[in-house]
Interface confidence: low
């Protein structure tokens, strides 16, 4: 069986200051079981954005049906962007664990640059 | 299977504003997705007006954004729009459709209502 | 905004023939490109997806391909009820925008 891959389609977005961002992913298989997290940033000092599993991210929401059983889809949309905004998304799978889950694969990542605000 | 239904007064004064409903069956707008508006005037082509998330999270087109104002109910399961000002260039048939374009793959719209006409005249 | 522009405006076309349809970007859209199928007096109905994937329920017949800035939609052997208007639509870059329509009428 094909091992999960995480597709980020778009190597970037670009998003006026002020409006909404779409970060798309998804995977190739529903295995390993386990959920998905959004960081900005890779490494120790990165920023978790959104957990499946957990959490309250009043200005992310998911443009799917995640609780759907076949879900692969596990695209992303944040509101109210600004230049804070800026940086390199990774949508990333983690597998199952006890007592903790396990980070098991990285998509390649989506930098979102904000534009000025339109006049 | 999902079904949309739009409604509303088919006839506007210029200036005033228009008012439109999409009620949704068959599925829940808090489960996911976007939902659209889109247009066509008379005899032309298609215009997207801008989309909704069930959280409010808008996205609109740019040439109508300063009177546009779309809206959710999700207790009604209906989403809704607003466009001030009007005047007989908004005279068009109003669809309202679900947005499955924000996703990965990218479908597009794929389920519409019937459409509905407003008129924009005095 | 992108501009979708398609040709011909209107295809003639004898029952049983291949059609073919053109569907150009004024920029790229990656394959983030659908193409819809609009009969008189009803709502436009989603045909193909990603550029090539045919929407649940769509005849084989229909076909997408194309990536960037050109698309093509084939209809290998026109059926009466396919005489129709067929719109593309970016969705890659916002606003999300139509072609001005392809008209296929019968010859």
């Known amino acids: 069986e094909d091992e999960l891959q995480v597709i980020q389609p778009e190597k970037s977005v670009s998003v006026a200051a002020g409006e909404s961002a779409t970060l798309r992913c998804a995977m190739t298989s529903l295995i390993p079981v386990g959920p998905i997290m959004w960081f900005r940033g890779a490494g120790a000092g990165r920023e978790l954005i959104y957990n499946q599993k957990e959490g309250h991210f009043p200005r992310v929401t998911t443009v799917s049906e995640l609780t759907k059983r076949n879900n692969l889809d596990f695209s992303i949309s944040i509101s109210n962007i600004t230049p804070a905004d800026a940086g390199t998304y990774y949508c990333v799978k983690f597998r199952k664990g006890s007592p903790d889950d396990v980070e098991f694969k990285s998509g390649a990542g989506t930098e979102l640059s904000v534009r000025a605000k339109p006049s | 299977q999902v079904q949309l239904q739009e409604s509303g007064p088919g006839l506007v004064k210029p200036s005033e504003t228009l008012s439109l409903t999409c009620a949704v069956s068959g599925y829940s707008i808090s489960s996911g997705y976007y939902w659209a508006w889109i247009r066509q005037p008379p005899g032309k082509g298609l215009e997207w007006i801008g989309s909704i998330y069930h959280s409010g999270s808008t996205y609109y087109n740019p040439s109508l954004k300063s009177r546009v104002t779309i809206s959710v109910d999700t207790s009604k399961n209906q989403f809704s729009l607003k466009l001030s000002s009007v005047t007989a260039a908004d005279t068009a048939v109003y669809y309202c459709?679900?947005?499955?374009?924000?996703?990965?793959?990218?479908?597009?719209?794929?389920?519409w209502g019937q459409g509905t006409t407003v008129t924009v005249s005095s | 905004e992108i501009v979708m522009t398609q040709s011909p405006a209107t295809l003639s076309v004898s029952p049983g023939e291949r059609a073919t349809l053109s569907c150009r970007a004024s920029q790229s859209v990656s394959s983030n490109l659908a193409w819809y199928q609009q009969k008189p007096g009803q709502a436009p109905r989603l045909l193909i997806y990603g550029a090539s994937t045919r929407a649940t329920g769509i005849p084989a017949r229909f076909s997408g391909s194309g990536s960037g800035t050109e698309f093509t939609l084939t209809i290998s052997s026109l059926q009466s009820e396919d005489f129709a208007v067929y719109y593309c639509?970016?969705?890659?870059?916002?606003?999300?925008?139509f072609g001005g329509g392809t008209k296929v009428e019968i010859k």
């Open positions: 459709a679900r947005d499955r374009s924000r996703g990965y793959p990218v479908y597009g719209m794929d389920v």
């Open positions: 639509q970016q969705l890659n870059i916002h606003p999300w925008t």
